[in-house]
Amino acid sequence: MMTGTIETTGNISAEKGGSIILQCHLSSTTAQVTQVNWEQQDQLLAICNADLGWHISPSFKDRVAPGPGLGLTLQSLTVNDTGEYFCIYHTYPDGTYTGRIFLEVLESSVAEHGARFQIP
Protein backbone atom coordinates (compact mmCIF):
# COMPACT_ATOMS: atom_id res chain seq x y z
CA MET A 1 0.00 0.00 0.00
CA MET A 2 1.27 3.49 -0.85
CA THR A 3 1.29 5.49 2.37
CA GLY A 4 3.59 8.33 1.32
CA THR A 5 2.64 11.90 0.58
CA ILE A 6 4.41 14.53 -1.51
CA GLU A 7 4.78 18.05 -0.18
CA THR A 8 5.76 20.71 -2.69
CA THR A 9 7.01 24.29 -2.59
CA GLY A 10 3.50 25.30 -3.62
CA ASN A 11 2.56 27.30 -6.69
CA ILE A 12 4.84 30.20 -7.55
CA SER A 13 4.33 33.50 -9.34
CA ALA A 14 7.60 35.01 -10.54
CA GLU A 15 8.83 37.77 -12.80
CA LYS A 16 10.44 37.30 -16.21
CA GLY A 17 14.24 37.13 -15.94
CA GLY A 18 14.21 35.90 -12.36
CA SER A 19 14.99 32.46 -10.96
CA ILE A 20 13.04 30.11 -8.72
CA ILE A 21 13.51 26.82 -6.89
CA LEU A 22 11.08 23.94 -7.34
CA GLN A 23 11.15 21.40 -4.54
CA CYS A 24 9.23 18.33 -3.48
CA HIS A 25 9.56 16.22 -0.37
CA LEU A 26 8.31 12.67 0.06
CA SER A 27 7.20 11.81 3.59
CA SER A 28 5.22 9.18 5.55
CA THR A 29 6.85 6.23 3.83
CA THR A 30 9.93 4.08 4.37
CA ALA A 31 10.17 3.34 0.65
CA GLN A 32 13.54 3.88 -0.98
CA VAL A 33 13.71 6.65 -3.58
CA THR A 34 15.47 5.25 -6.63
CA GLN A 35 14.97 8.21 -8.98
CA VAL A 36 13.28 11.62 -9.19
CA ASN A 37 12.18 12.96 -12.57
CA TRP A 38 11.28 16.60 -13.16
CA GLU A 39 8.90 17.15 -16.06
CA GLN A 40 6.88 19.94 -17.62
CA GLN A 41 3.99 19.21 -19.98
CA ASP A 42 5.40 15.80 -21.02
CA GLN A 43 8.92 17.24 -21.44
CA LEU A 44 11.68 15.79 -19.31
CA LEU A 45 13.73 18.55 -17.67
CA ALA A 46 15.99 16.57 -15.38
CA ILE A 47 16.60 13.25 -13.63
CA CYS A 48 18.23 12.62 -10.28
CA ASN A 49 19.13 8.93 -10.01
CA ALA A 50 20.16 7.50 -6.64
CA ASP A 51 23.15 5.73 -8.21
CA LEU A 52 24.01 7.82 -11.27
CA GLY A 53 23.32 11.32 -9.94
CA TRP A 54 21.91 14.19 -12.01
CA HIS A 55 21.16 14.38 -15.71
CA ILE A 56 19.81 17.64 -17.15
CA SER A 57 18.10 17.49 -20.55
CA PRO A 58 20.34 19.14 -23.16
CA SER A 59 17.68 21.67 -24.19
CA PHE A 60 17.47 22.98 -20.60
CA LYS A 61 21.16 22.76 -19.64
CA ASP A 62 21.82 26.49 -19.78
CA ARG A 63 18.82 27.48 -17.62
CA VAL A 64 18.27 24.57 -15.24
CA ALA A 65 20.54 23.75 -12.32
CA PRO A 66 20.29 20.67 -10.09
CA GLY A 67 19.35 21.12 -6.43
CA PRO A 68 19.12 22.11 -3.74
CA GLY A 69 18.67 18.49 -2.69
CA LEU A 70 16.32 16.72 -5.06
CA GLY A 71 14.89 20.08 -6.18
CA LEU A 72 15.49 22.05 -9.33
CA THR A 73 16.54 25.66 -9.91
CA LEU A 74 15.10 27.44 -12.97
CA GLN A 75 17.02 30.52 -14.10
CA SER A 76 16.46 33.34 -16.61
CA LEU A 77 12.73 32.75 -16.55
CA THR A 78 10.65 33.52 -19.62
CA VAL A 79 6.87 33.77 -19.93
CA ASN A 80 7.09 30.53 -21.91
CA ASP A 81 8.13 28.77 -18.69
CA THR A 82 4.62 29.31 -17.34
CA GLY A 83 3.05 25.92 -16.78
CA GLU A 84 2.72 22.91 -14.53
CA TYR A 85 5.82 21.11 -13.30
CA PHE A 86 5.84 17.58 -11.97
CA CYS A 87 8.23 15.91 -9.55
CA ILE A 88 7.93 12.17 -10.08
CA TYR A 89 9.39 10.04 -7.31
CA HIS A 90 10.19 6.46 -8.31
CA THR A 91 10.36 4.39 -5.14
CA TYR A 92 10.78 0.80 -4.07
CA PRO A 93 8.60 -0.97 -3.15
CA ASP A 94 5.81 1.63 -3.21
CA GLY A 95 5.96 2.69 -6.86
CA THR A 96 5.51 6.21 -8.21
CA TYR A 97 4.50 9.38 -6.35
CA THR A 98 3.82 12.62 -8.21
CA GLY A 99 3.80 16.22 -6.99
CA ARG A 100 2.47 19.19 -8.97
CA ILE A 101 3.67 22.80 -8.94
CA PHE A 102 2.30 25.55 -11.16
CA LEU A 103 4.72 28.28 -12.13
CA GLU A 104 3.36 31.59 -13.42
CA VAL A 105 5.95 33.83 -15.06
CA LEU A 106 4.78 37.40 -15.53
CA GLU A 107 5.98 40.14 -17.86
CA SER A 108 7.25 43.09 -15.81
CA SER A 109 4.28 45.20 -16.97
CA VAL A 110 1.80 42.59 -15.73
CA ALA A 111 3.76 41.93 -12.53
CA GLU A 112 3.61 45.60 -11.59
CA HIS A 113 -0.14 45.80 -12.22
CA GLY A 114 -1.82 45.68 -8.81
CA ALA A 115 1.30 44.06 -7.37
CA ARG A 116 1.35 43.88 -3.62
CA PHE A 117 2.90 40.43 -3.49
CA GLN A 118 6.54 39.65 -2.93
CA ILE A 119 7.83 38.20 -6.18
CA PRO A 120 10.81 35.86 -5.96
Epitope: G10, I12, T82, I101, V110, Q118
Partner: antibody
Framework: EVQLQQSGPELVKPGASMKISCKAS????????MNWVKQSHGKNLEWIGL????????SYNQKFKGKATLTVDKSSSTAYMELLSLTSEDSAVYYC??????????WGQGTTLTVSS | DVVVTQTPLSLPVSFGDQVSISCRSS???????????LSWYLHKPGQSPQLLIY???NRFSGVPDRFSGSGSGTDFTLKISTIKPEDLGMYYC?????????FGGGTKLEIK
Protein backbone atom coordinates in the same frame (compact mmCIF):
# COMPACT_ATOMS: atom_id res chain seq x y z
CA GLU B 1 -12.10 47.24 -20.04
CA VAL B 2 -11.43 43.54 -19.47
CA GLN B 3 -14.28 41.37 -20.73
CA LEU B 4 -14.83 37.64 -21.06
CA GLN B 5 -17.80 36.82 -23.28
CA GLN B 6 -19.04 33.22 -23.12
CA SER B 7 -21.25 31.32 -25.57
CA GLY B 8 -24.94 30.87 -24.82
CA PRO B 9 -26.89 28.18 -22.94
CA GLU B 10 -26.89 24.63 -24.27
CA LEU B 11 -29.35 21.74 -24.07
CA VAL B 12 -27.71 18.47 -25.11
CA LYS B 13 -28.46 14.78 -25.02
CA PRO B 14 -26.62 12.30 -22.78
CA GLY B 15 -23.54 10.83 -24.47
CA ALA B 16 -23.01 13.87 -26.67
CA SER B 17 -20.12 16.32 -26.48
CA MET B 18 -20.20 20.12 -26.61
CA LYS B 19 -17.82 23.07 -26.69
CA ILE B 20 -18.10 26.34 -24.75
CA SER B 21 -16.24 29.43 -25.94
CA CYS B 22 -14.86 32.37 -23.97
CA LYS B 23 -13.80 35.42 -25.99
CA ALA B 24 -11.40 37.74 -24.20
CA SER B 25 -11.03 41.46 -24.86
CA UNK B 26 -9.51 44.51 -23.22
CA UNK B 27 -6.16 42.95 -22.30
CA UNK B 28 -3.24 40.95 -23.69
CA UNK B 29 -4.74 37.46 -24.05
CA UNK B 30 -1.37 35.69 -23.95
CA UNK B 31 -0.27 37.43 -20.75
CA UNK B 32 -2.65 35.63 -18.38
CA UNK B 33 -3.79 32.07 -17.81
CA MET B 34 -7.44 31.17 -18.40
CA ASN B 35 -9.31 28.96 -15.95
CA TRP B 36 -12.59 27.09 -16.10
CA VAL B 37 -14.87 26.64 -13.10
CA LYS B 38 -17.98 24.48 -12.66
CA GLN B 39 -20.89 25.52 -10.46
CA SER B 40 -23.33 22.74 -9.64
CA HIS B 41 -26.73 23.15 -7.96
CA GLY B 42 -26.21 26.91 -7.72
CA LYS B 43 -23.64 26.47 -4.96
CA ASN B 44 -20.44 24.42 -5.14
CA LEU B 45 -17.57 25.86 -7.17
CA GLU B 46 -15.03 23.45 -8.63
CA TRP B 47 -11.88 24.27 -10.57
CA ILE B 48 -11.79 22.24 -13.80
CA GLY B 49 -8.44 23.31 -15.17
CA LEU B 50 -6.50 26.08 -16.88
CA UNK B 51 -4.75 26.80 -20.12
CA UNK B 52 -1.75 29.02 -20.80
CA UNK B 53 -2.63 30.88 -24.02
CA UNK B 54 1.02 31.77 -24.65
CA UNK B 55 2.26 28.18 -25.01
CA UNK B 56 -0.88 26.02 -24.97
CA UNK B 57 0.11 24.32 -21.72
CA UNK B 58 -2.70 22.93 -19.59
CA SER B 59 -3.30 21.85 -16.02
CA TYR B 60 -6.36 19.81 -15.04
CA ASN B 61 -8.12 18.87 -11.87
CA GLN B 62 -7.73 15.05 -11.92
CA LYS B 63 -11.50 14.79 -11.44
CA PHE B 64 -12.07 16.37 -14.87
CA LYS B 65 -9.28 14.66 -16.82
CA GLY B 66 -10.93 12.88 -19.72
CA LYS B 67 -14.11 14.93 -19.23
CA ALA B 68 -12.83 18.38 -20.23
CA THR B 69 -10.40 19.41 -22.97
CA LEU B 70 -9.07 22.96 -22.98
CA THR B 71 -7.81 24.77 -26.08
CA VAL B 72 -7.19 28.33 -27.25
CA ASP B 73 -7.20 30.24 -30.51
CA LYS B 74 -4.70 33.05 -30.07
CA SER B 75 -5.71 34.77 -33.30
CA SER B 76 -9.23 35.43 -31.98
CA SER B 77 -8.28 35.65 -28.26
CA THR B 78 -10.73 32.86 -27.51
CA ALA B 79 -10.51 29.99 -25.04
CA TYR B 80 -12.55 26.83 -25.48
CA MET B 81 -13.63 24.00 -23.21
CA GLU B 82 -14.96 20.81 -24.76
CA LEU B 83 -16.95 18.52 -22.47
CA LEU B 84 -17.09 14.87 -23.52
CA SER B 85 -19.54 11.98 -23.01
CA LEU B 86 -22.05 14.14 -21.20
CA THR B 87 -24.28 12.85 -18.40
CA SER B 88 -26.82 14.54 -16.11
CA GLU B 89 -23.95 15.08 -13.63
CA ASP B 90 -22.45 17.54 -16.09
CA SER B 91 -25.51 19.80 -15.95
CA ALA B 92 -24.17 22.99 -14.38
CA VAL B 93 -23.09 26.57 -15.00
CA TYR B 94 -19.55 26.82 -16.41
CA TYR B 95 -17.41 29.94 -16.06
CA CYS B 96 -14.17 30.99 -17.67
CA UNK B 97 -12.02 33.18 -15.44
CA UNK B 98 -8.74 34.99 -16.00
CA UNK B 99 -6.13 34.48 -13.33
CA UNK B 100 -3.28 36.54 -12.00
CA UNK B 101 -1.19 35.29 -9.09
CA UNK B 102 -3.61 32.40 -8.58
CA UNK B 103 -6.67 34.57 -7.98
CA UNK B 104 -9.47 34.88 -10.53
CA UNK B 105 -9.76 38.58 -11.25
CA UNK B 106 -12.24 38.61 -14.16
CA TRP B 107 -15.02 36.10 -14.91
CA GLY B 108 -17.20 35.35 -17.91
CA GLN B 109 -20.98 35.61 -17.51
CA GLY B 110 -21.36 31.82 -17.29
CA THR B 111 -22.76 29.21 -19.68
CA THR B 112 -25.63 27.02 -18.53
CA LEU B 113 -25.42 23.43 -19.72
CA THR B 114 -28.42 21.13 -19.39
CA VAL B 115 -27.96 17.46 -20.22
CA SER B 116 -31.30 15.78 -20.79
CA SER B 117 -32.87 13.26 -23.14
CA ASP C 1 -6.22 17.92 -2.60
CA VAL C 2 -6.29 20.71 -0.04
CA VAL C 3 -9.64 20.81 1.74
CA VAL C 4 -11.00 24.31 2.38
CA THR C 5 -13.66 24.64 5.07
CA GLN C 6 -15.76 27.76 5.32
CA THR C 7 -17.88 28.76 8.33
CA PRO C 8 -20.62 29.58 8.89
CA LEU C 9 -22.68 28.08 6.06
CA SER C 10 -25.32 30.75 6.53
CA LEU C 11 -25.05 34.19 8.08
CA PRO C 12 -28.30 36.07 8.81
CA VAL C 13 -27.54 39.80 9.14
CA SER C 14 -29.14 43.22 9.50
CA PHE C 15 -27.95 46.17 7.44
CA GLY C 16 -25.20 48.02 9.29
CA ASP C 17 -23.91 44.86 11.02
CA GLN C 18 -20.26 43.87 11.10
CA VAL C 19 -19.63 40.21 10.20
CA SER C 20 -16.75 37.77 9.84
CA ILE C 21 -16.45 34.70 7.63
CA SER C 22 -13.84 32.06 8.39
CA CYS C 23 -11.88 29.92 5.95
CA ARG C 24 -9.64 27.05 7.11
CA SER C 25 -7.38 24.87 4.97
CA SER C 26 -6.15 21.34 5.58
CA UNK C 27 -2.53 22.46 5.09
CA UNK C 28 -0.57 25.69 5.14
CA UNK C 29 -1.21 28.00 2.22
CA UNK C 30 2.18 29.71 2.40
CA UNK C 31 4.46 28.64 -0.42
CA UNK C 32 8.23 28.23 -0.04
CA UNK C 33 8.72 31.96 -0.69
CA UNK C 34 6.28 32.89 2.08
CA UNK C 35 3.58 33.99 -0.36
CA UNK C 36 0.00 32.90 0.36
CA UNK C 37 -2.48 32.65 -2.50
CA LEU C 38 -5.81 32.97 -0.69
CA SER C 39 -8.60 35.02 -2.26
CA TRP C 40 -12.25 35.89 -1.50
CA TYR C 41 -15.20 36.20 -3.89
CA LEU C 42 -18.79 37.43 -3.76
CA HIS C 43 -21.32 35.68 -5.96
CA LYS C 44 -24.63 37.52 -6.28
CA PRO C 45 -27.69 35.80 -7.80
CA GLY C 46 -27.77 36.12 -11.58
CA GLN C 47 -24.22 37.49 -11.76
CA SER C 48 -20.70 36.10 -12.10
CA PRO C 49 -18.49 35.73 -9.03
CA GLN C 50 -16.43 38.86 -8.35
CA LEU C 51 -12.99 39.07 -6.78
CA LEU C 52 -12.93 40.99 -3.49
CA ILE C 53 -9.61 40.15 -1.84
CA TYR C 54 -6.43 38.50 -3.15
CA UNK C 55 -3.23 37.48 -1.37
CA UNK C 56 -5.02 37.28 2.02
CA UNK C 57 -5.57 41.01 2.50
CA ASN C 58 -5.26 42.99 -0.76
CA ARG C 59 -8.49 44.59 -1.94
CA PHE C 60 -9.13 44.24 -5.66
CA SER C 61 -9.68 47.47 -7.61
CA GLY C 62 -13.05 49.07 -6.91
CA VAL C 63 -13.75 46.98 -3.81
CA PRO C 64 -14.96 49.19 -0.91
CA ASP C 65 -12.76 49.43 2.17
CA ARG C 66 -15.49 47.93 4.36
CA PHE C 67 -14.13 44.59 3.08
CA SER C 68 -10.92 43.39 4.71
CA GLY C 69 -9.04 40.12 4.80
CA SER C 70 -6.60 38.70 7.33
CA GLY C 71 -4.97 35.47 8.45
CA SER C 72 -1.98 33.23 7.83
CA GLY C 73 -1.02 29.58 7.50
CA THR C 74 -4.30 27.67 7.59
CA ASP C 75 -6.67 30.26 9.15
CA PHE C 76 -8.19 33.17 7.25
CA THR C 77 -10.97 35.68 7.83
CA LEU C 78 -13.04 38.02 5.69
CA LYS C 79 -14.57 40.95 7.59
CA ILE C 80 -17.33 43.22 6.34
CA SER C 81 -17.56 46.25 8.60
CA THR C 82 -20.97 47.70 7.71
CA ILE C 83 -23.32 45.43 5.74
CA LYS C 84 -25.10 47.09 2.81
CA PRO C 85 -27.86 45.62 0.60
CA GLU C 86 -25.42 45.06 -2.28
CA ASP C 87 -23.28 42.80 -0.04
CA LEU C 88 -25.88 40.02 0.09
CA GLY C 89 -24.99 36.80 -1.71
CA MET C 90 -22.64 33.82 -1.48
CA TYR C 91 -19.07 34.34 -0.32
CA TYR C 92 -16.31 31.89 -1.29
CA CYS C 93 -12.65 31.62 -0.42
CA UNK C 94 -10.19 30.02 -2.83
CA UNK C 95 -6.76 28.59 -2.16
CA UNK C 96 -4.41 28.86 -5.13
CA UNK C 97 -1.19 27.76 -3.45
CA UNK C 98 -1.52 24.03 -4.12
CA UNK C 99 -2.62 22.12 -7.20
CA UNK C 100 -5.49 21.82 -7.80
CA UNK C 101 -6.94 25.14 -6.58
CA UNK C 102 -9.90 24.51 -4.26
CA PHE C 103 -12.84 26.61 -3.12
CA GLY C 104 -14.52 26.73 0.25
CA GLY C 105 -18.11 25.50 0.40
CA GLY C 106 -19.50 29.03 0.55
CA THR C 107 -21.22 31.25 3.12
CA LYS C 108 -24.65 32.69 2.36
CA LEU C 109 -25.05 36.24 3.63
CA GLU C 110 -28.79 36.92 3.96
CA ILE C 111 -31.15 39.25 5.75
CA LYS C 112 -32.46 38.13 9.15
Amino acid sequence: EVQLQQSGPELVKPGASMKISCKASGYSFTGYTMNWVKQSHGKNLEWIGLIVPNNGGTSYNQKFKGKATLTVDKSSSTAYMELLSLTSEDSAVYYCARSLRFSFDYWGQGTTLTVSS
Amino acid sequence: DVVVTQTPLSLPVSFGDQVSISCRSSQSLANSYGTTYLSWYLHKPGQSPQLLIYGISNRFSGVPDRFSGSGSGTDFTLKISTIKPEDLGMYYCLQGTHQPPTFGGGTKLEIK
